[in-house]
C-alpha cells in the first residue's frame, strides 16, 4: 500500500509541495489522515497527520467544546493506493475573530497562542489579547493547554493559550481518537503564563484545614469533592455544537458531541482539476470566522471546520 | 475561471526597489498557498518564495532571502513581493501561482523586471 | 545549475514517443516528494501538465504520463503533435533548500 505522508503544525508540513508518499509495511492495509482543530475567540488552527495507519477504513468527525474552545476533530482511514488526501488540512487562521473591533473588551487579558509553537509559547512570550463575549458567552477565564494528535505512529502537540468561560478549571480536556485538547484555567490578567502546574485548589474553593482533634466525641463529617459533580450529558446533533443550559458547577466534565457529517464523495484525487478552489483538499479551506457564527457545523465538503466564507 | 494579473514591473537600478502585486479572482484567495515564480530571459524556472493562506508561514529562496519579502491582503484578494537592493541577477520575469494539490496549479501572465543602469 | 537534472532537448517526428528524465537526490525526489511537470510554450506562462508524479489536470490528454521511481521521474510523450514543442519542467520540494525546485528545463523539438 502506497500512502502520502506529511505532518502539520498550525498551517505548516502538509503545504501543497510538501506531500510526500511512502510504501507501507507488511499488513499495514489503510491510509490514515488526521486533522485536528482549535478554535479560540482570537483565532483558529490545525494540526494534521497523514501516513500509514491502522485499524478498518472509516470516517469519524467530531465537534468537542472546552469552556468556549472549541475543536474538531476529523479521522479518514481508507484502503486505496494514495486515498489519504481528502480531508482539508490547510486552515486559514483567523485575523481576529470577524470584525473584533466590534466587541467591547471585558476586561480580562490573557497570553494567546494560536498556531505557535511550543518556543513561541513560553511564559511571557506571546502576544496579549483582551478578552470579549460572544455568541452570548462570557470569555472572562484564561486558558493553558496543549492540542495533541496522534495517528499514523506519530505524534503532534502544539501549545494552546487564550481566553475562556472558566475560570478555575483544572487539568480538564475532551478526547477523540488520538485527539486531545486539555489544560487548565485561571482568572486574572495574564494568569495564564504557565499552569502546567495547576493543583486542584482554586479562590472558590477553601482549603483544606487541620483542625487539632477534638476534645469531645463528635460524629465524622467527610467533605464532598468539589470536582466530582455529575455532568449532564450533551444531546447528539448532526447539524450544531450545542451547549447544555443545565446549570453546572465548574468542574463539571467536558462535553462530547459526536456530528453526523456529509461527506463530499465526488472528489476523488484522480484526474480532473489540480485543487480548484482550494489547497491540499476538496472545497475551499476553513476560512474567516466570527464567534457569532460558530454554531454551524457544515453539512458538507469533507467535514470542514465551519466558514464564515466558504469557496 | 481562475485569474492571476501581475503588475509593478520595470525597469529599475541596481540597490533601488520595486514592489510587485498580483490580483487574484476566480477563486477563494483565502484558502490558498501562493508563490512568486520568476524566470531570467533564456533560463529556467526559478522558485523565489511561498506564503501560507493566512500569512503565518514564509519561505525564500536563499537567492532572495534578506532582500526580498512576500505578503498578501486577504481582503483585497491580492498578493505582493517587495523587493529591495535589486541586482542584475534578479531581472526577470516574475509569476505569481497559485498552489493546487501539490503543484502550482494557475500561473499569471508574468511581469517583467529588469535592473540595469 | 538546477538541483534537478534534465536533459537541455529532445526531439522527435511526429506521432513518436519521446520521454524527458529529470534527476533528482534524497533530499527531494529520493525524499518521497511528490514530483511535478509543467509546459511553457513559446512567448506564455507555464502550464500544469502533470501532478503528484502521474495525475493530469482536466484538459490535459492522456498522450503525457508521467512516473517515479527511487531519485528520478519520467515525463513521457506519445503520439507526438507540433503543438507540443515547448519547454518542459520538473518540480519537486527540496528538503535542504527548503522550498520547491525546478529541473533546467527540456527544450522538445517536433521534427519535420
Known amino acids: 500500500l502506497e500512502c502520502y505522508s506529511c505532518v502539520q503544525k498550525a498551517d505548516d508540513g502538509c503545504s501543497p509541495h510538501r506531500m510526500k508518499t511512502v510504501k507501507c509495511g507488511p499488513g499495514v492495509d489503510v491510509c490514515t489522515e488526521a486533522v485536528g482543530a482549535v478554535e479560540t475567540i482570537h483565532g483558529q488552527f490545525s494540526v494534521a497527520v497523514r501516513g500509514c495507519g491502522s485499524g478498518i477504513p472509516g470516517k469519524n468527525d467530531r465537534g468537542l467544546d472546552l469552556h468556549g474552545l472549541l475543536a474538531f476533530f476529523q479521522l479518514q482511514q481508507c484502503s486505496e493506493d494514495r486515498c489519504n488526501a481528502k480531508l482539508n488540512l490547510t486552515l486559514r487562521g483567523l485575523n481576529p475573530a470577524g470584525n473584533e473591533s466590534a466587541y467591547e473588551p471585558n476586561g480580562a487579558e490573557c497570553y494567546s497562542c494560536v498556531g505557535l509553537s511550543r518556543e513561541k509559547c513560553q511564559g511571557s512570550m506571546p502576544p496579549v489579547v483582551n478578552c470579549y463575549n460572544a455568541s452570548g458567552r462570557v470569555y472572562k477565564g484564561c486558558f493553558d493547554g496543549n492540542v495533541t494528535l496522534t495517528a499514523a505512529n506519530v505524534t503532534v502537540s502544539l501549545p494552546v493559550r487564550g481566553c475562556v468561560q472558566d475560570e478555575t478549571c483544572t487539568r480538564d480536556g475532551v478526547t477523540g481518537p488520538g485527539f486531545t485538547l486539555s489544560g487548565s484555567c485561571c482568572q486574572g490578567p495574564r494568569c495564564n503564563a504557565d499552569l502546567r502546574n495547576k493543583t486542584y485548589f482554586s479562590p472558590r474553593i477553601p482549603p483544606l484545614v487541620l483542625l487539632p482533634p477534638p476534645t469531645t466525641a463528635a460524629p465524622s463529617t467527610r467533605a464532598q469533592n468539589s470536582s466530582s459533580t455529575t455532568s449532564t450529558a450533551a444531546p447528539t446533533t448532526t447539524t450544531s455544537i450545542i451547549k447544555p443550559t443545565t446549570a453546572q458547577a465548574s468542574h463539571t466534565s467536558p462535553h462530547e458531541m459526536d456530528l453526523e457529517v456529509i461527506q463530499e464523495e465526488g472528489a476523488s484525487l484522480s484526474g480532473g482539476a489540480a485543487g480548484h478552489g482550494g489547497t491540499a483538499g476538496h472545497g475551499g479551506a476553513a476560512g474567516h470566522q466570527d464567534r457569532s457564527n460558530m454554531e454551524k457545523y457544515p453539512g458538507k465538503g469533507g467535514a470542514q471546520i465551519p466558514a464564515k466564507g466558504g469557496s | 475561471e481562475v485569474q492571476l494579473l501581475e503588475s509593478g514591473g520595470g525597469l529599475v537600478q541596481p540597490g533601488g526597489s520595486l514592489r510587485l502585486s498580483c490580483a487574484a479572482s476566480g477563486f477563494t484567495f483565502s484558502n490558498a498557498w501562493m508563490s512568486w515564480v520568476r524566470q531570467a530571459p533564456g533560463k529556467g524556472l526559478e522558485w523565489v518564495s511561498y506564503?501560507?493562506?493566512?500569512?503565518?508561514?514564509?519561505y525564500y529562496a536563499d537567492s532572495v532571502k534578506g532582500r526580498f519579502t512576500i505578503s498578501r491582503d486577504n481582503s483585497k484578494n491580492t498578493l505582493y513581493l517587495q523587493m529591495n537592493s535589486l541586482r542584475a541577477e534578479d531581472t526577470a520575469v516574475y509569476y505569481c501561482?497559485?498552489?493546487?494539490?501539490?503543484?502550482?496549479?494557475?500561473w499569471g501572465q508574468g511581469t517583467l523586471v529588469t535592473v540595469s543602469s | 545549475e538546477s538541483v534537478l537534472t534534465q536533459p537541455p532537448s529532445v526531439s522527435g517526428a511526429p506521432g513518436q514517443r519521446v520521454t524527458i528524465s529529470c534527476t533528482g537526490s534524497?533530499?527531494?525526489?529520493?525524499?518521497?516528494?511528490?514530483v511535478h511537470w509543467y509546459q511553457q510554450l513559446p512567448g506564455t506562462a507555464p502550464k500544469l501538465l502533470i501532478y503528484d508524479n502521474n495525475k493530469r489536470p482536466s484538459g490535459v490528454p492522456d498522450r503525457f504520463s508521467g512516473s517515479k521511481s527511487g531519485t528520478s521521474a519520467s515525463l513521457a510523450i506519445s503520439g507526438l503533435r507540433s503543438e507540443d514543442e515547448a519547454d518542459y519542467y520538473c518540480a519537486a520540494w527540496d528538503d535542504r533548500l527548503n522550498g520547491p525546485v525546478f529541473g533546467g528545463g527540456t527544450k522538445l523539438t517536433v521534427l519535420g
Open positions: 506564503i501560507s493562506s493566512s500569512g503565518s508561514t514564509i
Open positions: 534524497s533530499s527531494n525526489i529520493g525524499a518521497g516528494y511528490v
Open positions: 501561482a497559485r498552489e493546487g494539490l501539490w503543484a502550482f496549479d494557475y
